[in-house]
Amino acid sequence: GSERTCCPVNWVEHERSCYWFSRSGKAWADADNYCRLEDAHLVVVTSWEEQKFVQHHIGPVNTWMGLHDQNGPWKWVDGTDYETGFKNWRPEQPDDWYGHGLGGGEDCAHFTDDGRWNDDVCQRPYRWVCETELDKASQEPPLL
């Protein structure tokens, strides 16, 4: 792979990562594909500091992140360990709610209007955030 030493145009650098913030919406899987084709991944939040940074840029808008449980356990798209990692769920979330009437539960995580996380139907067209690390050789993101 090739190392990325500076952020692409229209991306924001923060703590040796580059972030791109959408202003339109897509389903979670399509947002994931978009980031991958940018040699990036949906944002993986690893600290309170990173949470505040992302929250500042997205504002009070539902926004997808790179966390899902479509195959059972919750997983970050870059392989970061979920169980031992940073979490910022809203109270009583995630709840895998089936009452929305859209079929199935809720398997994809997003930032809510106050920045805390909620699980929701993956087909909802929310905004999204892509992230790629600097000084790291580009490689294929892990498969879902």
Partner: antibody, heavy 121, light 108 residues
Framework: EVQLLESGGGLVQPGGSLRLSCAAS????????MNWVRQAPGKGLEWVSV????????YYADSVKGRFTISRDNSKNTLYLQMNSLRAEDTAVYYC??????????????WGRGTLVTVSS | DIQMTQSPSSLSASVGDRVTITCRAS??????LYWYQQKPGKAPKLLIY???SLQSGVPSRFSGSGSGTDFTLTISSLQPEDFATYYC??????????FGPGTKVDIK
């Protein structure tokens, strides 16, 4: 000059293989995802495959999955399409096209002139 | 996958005519819609991106509109060089990037 130039097309028998190439110039090749789009004679456009700038992520149309492989060599500014188990319905002009991602949109702003692949016995 | 349809499949028009081509998506695609022009034996050329934005270098007689499922490409005053086939394409749910079947504009 900003351009894409395909090569490698030709006549091949059903079940055979062919490798197409697309030489890019005039832009930073490694910064862009690249696509193959095909057009059967007298028909419309059909997207075939896309590869990210680093080559790390690839996607395929269902019609070619498991038979075609997209790849790239950024040191040579070249995109490839390895086509195996070719069928008559793969007969088409194959275009390479540069993907632009702008404000969440994705479209093809630069196309090559195409190379014709004919699958026939 | 999202299906794209276009109407009409072909039309005959004269130089100076106002021409309208419609593209419809099988589900809402917001404004993730693009228009291309293709002349015989040539590669497609991007005209409109994000439903209504004119690509650099494209004449202002071309315009796009619509959002959701219904979109329109309009040529305000048809010129001789505009006789071609026009395709719409979506990227809302992609890959795959799906194209409409095309609309051929020929001389009346």
């Amino acid at each position: 000059e900003v351009q894409l130039l395909e090569s490698g097309g030709g006549l091949v028998q059903p079940g055979g293989s062919l490798r197409l190439s697309c030489a890019a110039s005039g832009f930073t090749f490694s910064s862009y995802a690249m696509n193959w789009v095909r057009q059967a004679p007298g028909k419309g456009l059909e997207w075939v495959s896309v590869i990210s700038g680093s080559g790390g992520s690839t996607y395929y149309a269902d019609s070619v999955k498991g038979r075609f492989t997209i790849s790239r060599d950024n040191s040579k500014n070249t995109l490839y399409l390895q086509m195996n188990s070719l069928r008559a319905e793969d007969t088409a002009v194959y275009y390479c096209a540069k993907r632009i991602a702008a404000a969440g949109t994705e479209y093809f702003d630069l196309w090559g002139r195409g190379t014709l692949v004919t699958v026939s016995s | 996958d999202i299906q794209m349809t276009q109407s009409p499949s072909s039309l005959s028009a004269s130089v100076g005519d106002r021409v309208t081509i419609t593209c419809r998506a099988s589900q809402s695609i917001s404004s993730y819609l693009y228009w291309y022009q293709q002349k015989p034996g040539k590669a497609p050329k991007l005209l409109i991106y994000a439903a209504s934005s004119l690509q650099s270098g494209v004449p202002s007689r071309f315009s796009g509109s619509g959002s959701g499922t219904d979109f329109t490409l309009t040529i305000s005053s048809l010129q001789p060089e505009d006789f071609a086939t026009y395709y719409c394409q979506q990227s809302y749910s992609a890959p795959p990037f799906t194209f409409g079947p095309g609309t051929k504009v020929d001389i009346k």
